[in-house]
C-alpha cells in the first residue's frame, strides 16, 4: 500500500487511480496515508471521478477516513439517495492525517476511468467550533498558522490547562463599615478553576454581619457535601460552611471584626454564584443629649464605634468646656462604648465688663452689670470738656463675645477733648496787654528748656509751637519742661507734662529766616482736660474768613513786658491782622533781608505800636474766635518781629497755621 508524503515534507500533491486516465483494473486496492504538521489539516477534492456504481458502494469505492472516523465512501459518477459521488465537494481531515483507500472488485460491467484528486495541508482554525460544541477557549481564542492560543479578560489569568480562565479574585480587602461582595461575574455564571479569597477587615470593636442576598447557586452533589465548588467563611473564632446548592444560607453574625471568604470552583459547571451584603455593628455609645441652647448633628437612632456627633449652639451661645472656649465640638464613639470627649455646654455669650473709657464713663442699659448676649451699654464722655468722636456710644454684646457699636466697631469710642473753649469774652483793647484770668487761655503751655517759650495744646497729647523755640531740644525731647494749667509763670501749682518726641518742620532752617517756623511736641501721656487745660482748635477751611485784615486776634504769653522783664502773670493782647503787603514792606528796609516775610506768615499789631508779642512769647498761639462755632482757633504762632517789641511801623510776625494743616494732621495721625 503506497504511503503518501510525511511531514515535514511539503504537504500537497495529486492522487489518481491506477492507470488513470485509462480504465482501472479489477481487484485493485490502493491506500494513501497523508500526514500534515501539527495544527494543520488536509484538504482533498476531486477533479475527476468515475467509478462503478453499486448499492452502498459495495463493489468499487474510494474511502476517506481520518483516524477512526470514515469521512466518506464514494462511488459512481453522481450521488444518489444511497450512494455518494464527490462532485465538487471538498473533504477535510479531522486531525492532521487523512487515509484514502481505493478498491475495485472482481468485475466491471463497463470500463471506468477512476479518479484524480488533489490534496494540500492547510491551517486548522481551532477557534471556530460547531454550534453546540464547547468553545475552544474560555474567553479569547487566537488562531495562528499551525495552532492557536487562549487569553483572558482583565481580572482573569489563564489556567495551566491553557484554555480555562481562572478569576483573579484574591486579595480584595473591604474596610468600609458596610458593603457588597459577590462571586466573579455575578449574576452571570462564575468562572471555572478559580480560587477566590475576600477579606473584610474593620477596626477592632466592630462585628461583621453577613447576609446572602438575591440568589445563591453553587454546583453541588446529591450525596457528597460540596465536592465541586464551595464557599467557606472563616473568622478568628470559627468557620462557617462549606456552602453550595441553590438555597440562600442564613445570616451569619460573626462577632468578629475580620472575616475571610473563600470561594473555590472546579473545571465544569454553569452556575450563577452568590452575593453577600455585609454590615457591621459595635457596642453603642450613650445617646448624646444636646445641652440646653444647643443641638446635636447628625441625629441617629444609635451611635456606634466611629460614629460621631457635633454640637452646635444657638446664636448668642458659645461652646464652653468649663471655662475653656471651643470653636467647634465633635465627639467620636470609641470601641468601649464611651465618647472620646465630654459634652460641652452652650453658655450664653458673656462679653464681660466693658473696658473703661478714658475721659468717659459707661452705663448699663439692659440692667445693672448685665454683660451677656444682646445686653446694651452706653458710653458717654465727660461733659463740657470731651465729646465722642464719630460714634453714638451705644454698644451691644454680640454673638462673637465683643461689645460692638451700631457701626460694627469693636474698639472703644474715643472721647476727644473739646477745643477752643475759653472763659474770656472779647474785651476792649488795653495798651500793652493785660493780665489773663483763670480759664481765659486754657491752651497756653509754658515751655522751659534753656529759654522760656510757649506753645498751645492740641488734642490732649500734642503741643503746637514755633520751630525756633524748641530747635535746640529736637534730639533731646526729654529735656523740655512743659507746664500747663497755670497763670503764674513761677507758680509751683501746675500740671507737668513731658515730651516724647519733637517734630520740626522739614522746611525750617535754623538761623536762616523764619519760614516754616512750626513744630509739634508729642507728650508722653495724655493730659486731663478741665477748665484750665483745654486744647485750642485748628483752623477750619473756612477760618480765613475770620482772619482778614483788621480782624482781631489775641496773643498771650509770659514774654517780655514794657518793663523789659518776663511777665510773672500770663498776659494777653488783642491785635489786628495787618495787610500782608504792608507788613512785607515794613520788613524790606534794613537791617532786615529782602523776603523776610513769606506767604507762610501773617502779621498783627498796631501801626502806632505798643501792642505786640515779645521774646519769651515765642511759640504761643495767636488765636481767633470762630463766630460760627463759637470756638477759638489758632491762626498764628508767635515767630519773630522787630528787635524792639511794639515798635511803631513794625509788626509781630506769626507762622500762618492754616498753611500747615496737612503737615499737622499727617504728623499726628502717623505718630
Amino acid at each position: 500500500t503506497p504511503l503518501g508524503p510525511k511531514w515535514p515534507e511539503p504537504v500537497f500533491g495529486r492522487l489518481a487511480s491506477p492507470g488513470f486516465p485509462g480504465e482501472y483494473a479489477n481487484d485493485q486496492e490502493r491506500r494513501w496515508t497523508l500526514t500534515a504538521p501539527p495544527g494543520y489539516r488536509l484538504r482533498l477534492y476531486f477533479t475527476h471521478f468515475d467509478l462503478e456504481l453499486s448499492h452502498l458502494c459495495e463493489y468499487d469505492f474510494v474511502k476517506l477516513s481520518s483516524g477512526a472516523k470514515v469521512l466518506a465512501t464514494l462511488c459512481g459518477q453522481e450521488s444518489t439517495d444511497t450512494e455518494r459521488a464527490p462532485g465538487k465537494d471538498t473533504f477535510y481531515s479531522l486531525g492532521s492525517s487523512l487515509d484514502i483507500t481505493f478498491r475495485s472488485d472482481y468485475s466491471n460491467e463497463k470500463p471506468f476511468t477512476g479518479f484524480e484528486a488533489f490534496y494540500a495541508a492547510e491551517d486548522i482554525d481551532e477557534c471556530q467550533v460547531a454550534p453546540g460544541e464547547a468553545p475552544t477557549c474560555d474567553h479569547h481564542c487566537h488562531n495562528h498558522l499551525g495552532g492557536f492560543y487562549c487569553s483572558c479578560r482583565a481580572g482573569y489569568v489563564l489556567h495551566r490547562n491553557k484554555r480555562t480562565c481562572s478569576a483573579l479574585c484574591s486579595g480584595q480587602v473591604f474596610t468600609q463599615r458596610s458593603g457588597e461582595l459577590s462571586s466573579p461575574e455575578y449574576p452571570r455564571p462564575y468562572p471555572k478553576l478559580s480560587s477566590c479569597t475576600y477579606s473584610i477587615s474593620l477596626e477592632e470593636g466592630f462585628s461583621v454581619i453577613l447576609d446572602f442576598v438575591e440568589s445563591f447557586d453553587v454546583e453541588t452533589h446529591p450525596e457528597t457535601l460540596c465536592p465541586y465548588d464551595f464557599l467557606k467563611i472563616q473568622t478568628d473564632r470559627e468557620e462557617h460552611g462549606p456552602f453550595c446548592g441553590k438555597t440562600l444560607p442564613h445570616r451569619i453574625e460573626t462577632k468578629s471584626n475580620t472575616v475571610t471568604i473563600t470561594f473555590v470552583t472546579d473545571e465544569s459547571g454553569d452556575h450563577t454564584g452568590w452575593k453577600i451584603h455585609y454590615t457591621s455593628t459595635a457596642q453603642p455609645c450613650p445617646y448624646p443629649m444636646a445641652p440646653p441652647n444647643g443641638h446635636v448633628s447628625p441625629v441617629q437612632a444609635k451611635y456606634i464605634l466611629k460614629d460621631s456627633f457635633s454640637i452646635f449652639c444657638e446664636t448668642g451661645y458659645e461652646l464652653l468646656q468649663g471655662h475653656l472656649p471651643l470653636k467647634s465640638f465633635t465627639a467620636v464613639c470609641q470601641k468601649d462604648g464611651s465618647w472620646d470627649r465630654p459634652m460641652p455646654a452652650c453658655s450664653i455669650v458673656d462679653c464681660g465688663p466693658p473696658d473703661d473709657l478714658p475721659s468717659g464713663r459707661v452705663e448699663y442699659i439692659t440692667g445693672p452689670g448685665v454683660t451677656t448676649y444682646k445686653a446694651v451699654i452706653q458710653y458717654s464722655c465727660e461733659e463740657t470738656f470731651y465729646t465722642m468722636k464719630v460714634n453714638d456710644g451705644k454698644y451691644v454684646c454680640e454673638a462673637d463675645g465683643f461689645w460692638t457699636s451700631s457701626k460694627g466697631e469693636k474698639s472703644l469710642p474715643v472721647c476727644e477733648p473739646v477745643c477752643g473753649l475759653s472763659a474770656r469774652t472779647t474785651g476792649g483793647r488795653i495798651y500793652g496787654g493785660q493780665k489773663a484770668k483763670p480759664g481765659d487761655f486754657p491752651w497756653q503751655v509754658l515751655i522751659l528748656g534753656g529759654t522760656t517759650a510757649a506753645g498751645a495744646l492740641l488734642y490732649d497729647n500734642w503741643v503746637l509751637t514755633a520751630a525756633h523755640a524748641v530747635y535746640e531740644q529736637k534730639h533731646d525731647a526729654s529735656a523740655l519742661d512743659i507746664r500747663m494749667g497755670t497763670l503764674k509763670r513761677l507758680s509751683p501749682h501746675y500740671t507737668q507734662a513731658w515730651s516724647e518726641a519733637v517734630f520740626i518742620h522739614e522746611g525750617y532752617t535754623h538761623d536762616a529766616g523764619f519760614d516754616n517756623d512750626i513744630a509739634l511736641i508729642k507728650l508722653n501721656n495724655k493730659v486731663v482736660i478741665n477748665s484750665n487745660i483745654t486744647p485750642i482748635c485748628l483752623p477750619r477751611k473756612e477760618a480765613e474768613s475770620f482772619m482778614r485784615t483788621d480782624d482781631i486776634g489775641t496773643a498771650s504769653g509770659w514774654g517780655l513786658t514794657q518793663r523789659g522783664f518776663l511777665a510773672r502773670n500770663l498776659m494777653y493782647v488783642d491785635i489786628p491782622i495787618v495787610d500782608h503787603q504792608k507788613c512785607t514792606a515794613a520788613y524790606e528796609k534794613p537791617p532786615y533781608p529782602r523776603g523776610s516775610v513769606t506767604a507762610n506768615m501773617l502779621c498783627a499789631g498796631l501801626e502806632s505800636g505798643g501792642k505786640d508779642s515779645c521774646r519769651g512769647d515765642s511759640g504761643g498761639a495767636l488765636v481767633f474766635l470762630d463766630s460760627e462755632t463759637e470756638r477759638w482757633f489758632v491762626g498764628g504762632i508767635v515767630s519773630w518781629g522787630s528787635m524792639n517789641c511794639g515798635e511803631a511801623g513794625q509788626y509781630g510776625v506769626y507762622t500762618k497755621v492754616i498753611n500747615y494743616i496737612p503737615w499737622i494732621e499727617n504728623i499726628i495721625s502717623d505718630f
Epitope: G322, H323, P325, K327, P344, A345, F402
Partner: antibody, heavy 117, light 112 residues
Framework: DVQLQESGPGLVKPSQSLSLTCTVT?????????WNWIRQFPGNKLEWMGY???????NYNPSLKSRFSITRDTSKNQFFLQLNSVTTEDTATYYC??????????WGQGTLVTVSA | DVLMTQTPLSLPVSLGDQASISCRSS???????????LEWYLQKPGQSPKLLIY???NRFSGVPDRFSGSGSGTDFTLKISRVEAEDLGVYYC?????????FGAGTKLELK
C-alpha cells in the same frame, strides 16, 4: 502636631514693661481653643496668667488684670504677653500653652525672665 | 481663689513601689455644668509640665496605665501602681473649674 515656642528678653528692669511672644506651629490660633500664659516662680509655684481664645477674646487672672494683657497677630500665628510695671516679684519662667477639653495638654519649653536693675 | 493643698510635699520611694499623692481644694471644684476639672501634671527637671490626668480620672493620651486618678468634691488622689525611674519629678494638681484656675504647690517624687 502643635508646637509652641516662647521668646523675649531674658532681663527686664523694674518698672518697665515685659513683652513675650509665643509662636505657634502646626495649628492656627484662630482655628480653635484657648491660648494661655502660665508662669513658674523660682520656688516652683505655678500661676495661670490668662488666655486669648480663638476668637480673640481674653480671660485674665484677676490678680494681674490691671497690668497684664494678651494680644495676637493672626498673620504670624503668634500671641503675646505684656506685663506692665514689673518688679523683682515677676521674675519667673514664662510658658505658653494650648487648651483642649482640658487646660494645658500642650506647653512651650518656657523662657526665663529676670527682673533686675 | 481656690487653694489647692498637696500632701506630702516630698515623697521618697523605691522603684517598683506604689505611690500616692493627695490634693485637697479649699472649696468644691465641681463646675456648674457638673464636671470636675481636676488635672494632674508631672514636671521633670528642666522640662515644662506634662498633662497626666484630666477630669479627675481620665488618662491623657500616651500616659501609662500605672497612673490613676480618683476623688470627688474637694479630695483627690493620684496613684502610681509601680514607680519607674521616668516617673520621678514634681507632681502638681490643678483645678480648672473656677477662675482663676490654680495649681497645687507640688509634690516631689524622689528616690529613697
Amino acid at each position: 502636631d502643635v508646637q509652641l515656642q516662647e521668646s523675649g528678653p531674658g532681663l527686664v528692669k523694674p518698672s518697665q514693661s515685659l513683652s513675650l511672644t509665643c509662636t505657634v506651629t502646626g495649628f492656627s490660633i484662630t482655628s480653635d481653643y484657648a491660648w494661655n500664659w502660665i508662669r513658674q516662680f523660682p520656688g516652683n509655684k505655678l500661676e495661670w496668667m490668662g488666655y486669648i481664645s480663638y476668637s480673640g477674646r481674653t480671660n485674665y487672672n484677676p490678680s494681674l488684670k490691671s497690668r497684664f494683657s494678651i494680644t495676637r497677630d493672626t498673620s504670624k500665628n503668634q500671641f503675646f504677653l505684656q506685663l506692665n510695671s514689673v518688679t523683682t516679684e515677676d521674675t519667673a519662667t514664662y510658658y505658653c500653652a494650648r487648651s483642649y477639653d482640658y487646660w494645658f495638654p500642650y506647653w512651650g519649653q518656657g523662657t526665663l525672665v529676670t527682673v533686675s536693675a | 481663689d481656690v487653694l489647692m493643698t498637696q500632701t506630702p510635699l516630698s515623697l521618697p520611694v523605691s522603684l517598683g513601689d506604689q505611690a500616692s499623692i493627695s490634693c485637697r481644694s479649699s472649696q468644691s471644684i465641681v463646675h456648674s455644668n457638673g464636671n470636675t476639672f481636676l488635672e494632674w501634671y508631672l514636671q521633670k527637671p528642666g522640662q515644662s509640665p506634662k498633662l497626666l490626668i484630666y477630669k479627675v480620672s481620665n488618662r491623657f493620651s500616651g500616659v501609662p496605665d500605672r497612673f490613676s486618678g480618683s476623688g470627688s468634691g474637694t479630695d483627690f488622689t493620684l496613684k502610681i501602681s509601680r514607680v519607674e525611674a521616668e516617673d520621678l519629678g514634681v507632681y502638681y494638681c490643678f483645678q480648672g473649674s473656677h477662675i482663676p484656675v490654680t495649681f497645687g504647690a507640688g509634690t516631689k517624687l524622689e528616690l529613697k
